[in-house]
């Protein structure tokens, strides 16, 4: 195992190399499980000086019974059987959540000793022939210097002030509810509530992801796994908070829209443009009608100015529009907007933020929607206290600025937030929250107890599966004599038979051959890897075990290194791929240098524009110059000028 830092934000990690084929088979069994015992997925491994004996079950609680996945103008039946929740066997109070894709677990594991995060190794490590496929690190080893950036990952005060004023301009639409509707529905609902004591405590979400988010995570499965882990993370935080007597607030995904890379050119896709400021990005989300949802979020992979990781409209009990359950209405700029919205990004200053930071960002932005402004005052910002005892517990979720995510309070709401949120919940949750219940047949995902799921009769285009409107014993079951249903996976034909052994179910990539159906399951099997050390990513890297994960240096038994300016390197070299002899930094030199000419024949391999350079102090531009991140000139962050071009007029560089 490697005891070195994973990237500039994660101080220490260990590698995991359990058998992925075995876990993949167990996942397939759990998916088809009939017996109670087979429903559990077991994963055992040793890391960080302890044993992890995970017992996980498919998680059906995060997706509503009306759940749909929309992608490129299609509403798909989507199988989320790869999402799991569980615990460490024998460890009380432990909890795990994540996904199993191609036999690899990705997610988080909460233990008595803190939370561990598990991610694919190639997401971080691009310069080793890895003896492991995944990395695991402890929350204490996340050292996130920007935390929430200069403004808590939120926009600065002037942006919120502008938003607050705008929220006051909404025009209420008076809609008359017919009298008989009151009579018919009102008492019935009240009676139902009294008899079952069910409470409206679930906020249903619409999550959209833009093409850049898809580009980073690569597949629909991986995107849904990310959405799931974010929702699970905030669900855990809100469920365990007592909002002045209102308890068990939970979240459920009602609909997902995935914009794939194909949507980048679609003129109807509002998020297609590569460079959109953070306020404009939120506005684009708000211009859609989100009346069917409690909240509507867009997840992206964009590097917004000033270290902003998210933005959301702040809810209020009355007198102002915005936040949970807000309906679409007309505002002062003459546009109809839904202000039950927010956005988050997983990128900051050119790097991807750790999941923990992103989860807290999501909780923070949703906190705004629920009615909490940023924390202020000594009671609610203990991290600013001169008293060391208070200071060491850190600040709460709604703190405006830097939060490391590893202190006791970082995952909790302050009393200030609780007071604000409880007032908004009191007033608004009956407008759109629903009673929490398990997802059922009809949501397009094959779940526990279902053989298939092609949706309701108006959606089901499947000759193989009984739709959700059928009687109890038949719905979500395969029709007699049918082998499979396309809702189970891409290797089932519309004629309800497994596709033949030669049929393609996944395109090939730089490092993996195309996925080919195996003839006996509806799922697309894992792809065969291309040979190790095949060039990839425009010749800057090589394939390792089917992933574009190693540096081109490895092809010649070398290690990648950073040509840093302190080495007296020519500034031009800062954006070259540089190699060194293993464990010998003194030999670090550009691929174009005389030193490595026998390997690269004098050919200089350059980093991709946007890559970090000079030990993360800058990024490479299109001229292959390393631009310092906070230097003046073209990178100046232009404080307080997000999406306000008038302010730019007076800025000289």
């Amino acid at each position: 195992q490697y005891g070195n830092p994973l990237n500039k934000y994660i101080r220490h990690y260990e590698g995991l190399s359990y058998n992925v084929d075995s876990l993949h088979q167990k996942h397939q069994r759990a998916k088809r499980a009939v017996s109670h015992e087979d429903q559990f997925l077991r994963l055992d491994f040793h890391a960080h000086g302890r044993h992890f004996n995970l017992r996980m079950k498919r998680d059906t609680s995060l997706f509503s019974d009306e759940f749909k996945v929309e992608t490129s103008n299609k509403v798909l039946d989507y199988d989320t059987s790869h999402i799991y929740t569980g615990h460490i066997y024998g460890e009380e109070g432990s909890f795990s959540h994540g996904s199993v894709i191609d036999g690899r677990f990705e997610g988080f594991i909460q233990t008595r000793g803190g939370t561990f995060y598990v991610e694919p190794a190639e997401r971080y490590i691009k310069d080793r022939t890895l003896p492991f496929h995944s990395v695991i690190y402890h929350e204490d080893d996340i050292n996130y210097p920007h935390k929430y950036g200069p403004q808590g990952g939120c926009a600065d005060h002037s942006v919120f002030e502008r938003m607050r004023k705008y929220q006051m301009t909404g025009v209420e639409e008076v809609t008359q509810i017919p009298q008989e509707e009151h009579a018919a529905n009102g008492p019935e609902l009240l009676r139902k509530k009294r008899t079952t004591s069910a409470e409206k405590n679930t906020c249903q979400l619409y999550i959209q992801t833009d093409h850049l988010f898809f580009k980073y995570y690569g597949t629909r499965e991986a995107v849904i796994a990310q959405i799931s882990s974010h929702v699970k993370a905030i669900d855990t935080i809100y469920q365990t908070t007592d909002f002045s007597g209102i308890r068990n607030i939970s979240f459920m995904v009602k609909r997902i829209r995935i914009n794939t890379t194909a949507d980048e050119k679609d003129p109807t896709n509002p998020f297609r443009f590569p460079n959109i400021g953070v306020e404009k990005f939120l506005e684009l989300n708000s211009e859609q009608n989100h009346d069917d949802y409690c909240l509507a979020y867009v997840f992206t992979d964009r590097d917004f100015d000033d270290g902003v990781l998210g933005l959301a409209w702040v809810g209020a009990p009355s007198g102002s529009s915005g936040g949970i359950c807000e309906k679409s209405k007309l505002y002062s700029d003459g546009k109809k907007k839904s202000l039950n919205t927010g956005i988050i990004t997983v990128q900051n200053y050119g790097s991807h933020v750790p999941p923990k930071v992103s989860h807290i960002t999501f909780a923070h932005e949703v906190g705004h929607n629920f009615g909490s402004p940023h924390d202020s005052g000594t009671e609610c910002t203990p991290g600013e206290s001169k008293n060391l005892g208070q200071k060491e517990n850190g600040n709460y979720i709604m703190y405006a600025r830097a939060t490391s995510g590893d202190k006791l309070n970082n995952n909790k709401f302050s009393l200030c937030s609780i007071r604000n949120i409880s007032q908004v919940l009191e007033k608004k949750r009956n407008n759109c929250f629903v009673e929490s219940g398990q997802p059922i047949c009809g949501n397009g995902m094959v779940e526990q107890g279902e053989e298939c799921d092609c949706g309701y009769s108006d959606q089901c285009k499947d000759e193989c599966c009984f739709d959700a409107n059928q009687p109890e014993g038949r719905k979500c079951k395969l029709k007699p004599g049918k082998q499979c249903s396309p809702s189970q996976g891409p290797c089932c034909t519309a004629q309800c038979a497994f596709k033949s052994k030669s049929e393609k179910c996944r395109d090939d990539s730089d490092c993996a051959r195309e996925g080919i159906c195996n003839g006996f399951t509806a799922l697309c099997p894992a792809s065969d890897p291309k040979p190790n050390f095949t060039d990839c990513n425009r010749h800057t890297q090589v394939c390792i075990n089917g992933q574009c994960a190693g540096s081109i240096c490895e092809k010649y038994g070398l290690e990648e290194c950073t040509c840093a300016s302190s080495d007296g390197k020519d500034d031009k070299e800062l954006c070259h791929v540089c190699c060194m002899k293993k464990m010998d930094p003194s030999t670090c030199a550009s691929t174009g240098s005389v030193q490595w000419s026998r390997h690269f024949s004098g050919r200089t391999i350059t980093l991709q524009p946007g890559s970090p350079c000079n030990d993360f102090r800058g990024y490479c531009d299109v001229f292959m110059r390393c631009r310092l991140v906070d230097a003046d000139g073209p990178l100046a962050r232009l404080k307080k000028a997000i999406f306000s071009p008038e302010l730019y007029e007076n800025i000289a560089e």
Epitope: P274, I276, P609, Y619, D621, P634, P645, Y648, E649, E653
Partner: nanobody, 123 residues
Framework: EMQLVESGGGLVQTGGSLRLSCAAS????????VGWWRQAPGKERDVVAA????????DYVDSVKGRFTISRDNAENTVYLQMNSLKPEDTAVYYC????????????????WGQGTQVTVSS
């Protein structure tokens, strides 16, 4: 929405000169970093030169240094590319690009692009 219109392209002999113009609509042009890219037949679009908002920083790709000069006139909402000592390998469609976030321009992902103007250098 910003619109960029290039002009000034044409056919020229080796060693000759051309001056390309990029006219921008929108009164906030001064807020944008602007660059010139070119695309030769069958090749990828590559950067040529770029200029910051205040004109105090210009960049050129090695192959045009000393021959091409980028400049801007904010009063006229125009950016120029003066091309001297032209060579056959300079033959390409030249595009103007701009972005309010300079970082996007400098990492090759500008938001706004013009339609391009053809430059042909004959030997």
């Amino acid at each position: 929405e910003m619109q960029l219109v290039e002009s000034g392209g044409g056919l020229v002999q080796t060693g000759g000169s051309l001056r390309l113009s990029c006219a921008a609509s929108g009164r906030t042009f001064t807020s944008y970093c602007v660059g010139w890219w070119r695309q030769a037949p069958g090749k990828e679009r590559d950067v040529v030169a770029a200029i910051t908002r205040g004109s105090n920083s210009t960049d050129y790709v090695d192959s045009v240094k000393g021959r091409f000069t980028i400049s801007r006139d904010n009063a006229e909402n125009t950016v120029y590319l003066q091309m001297n000592s032209l060579k056959p390998e300079d033959t390409a469609v030249y595009y103007c690009a701009a972005d309010i976030n300079c970082r996007n321009l400098y990492t090759g992902r500008p938001e706004y692009w013009g339609q391009g103007t053809q430059v042909t250098v004959s030997s």
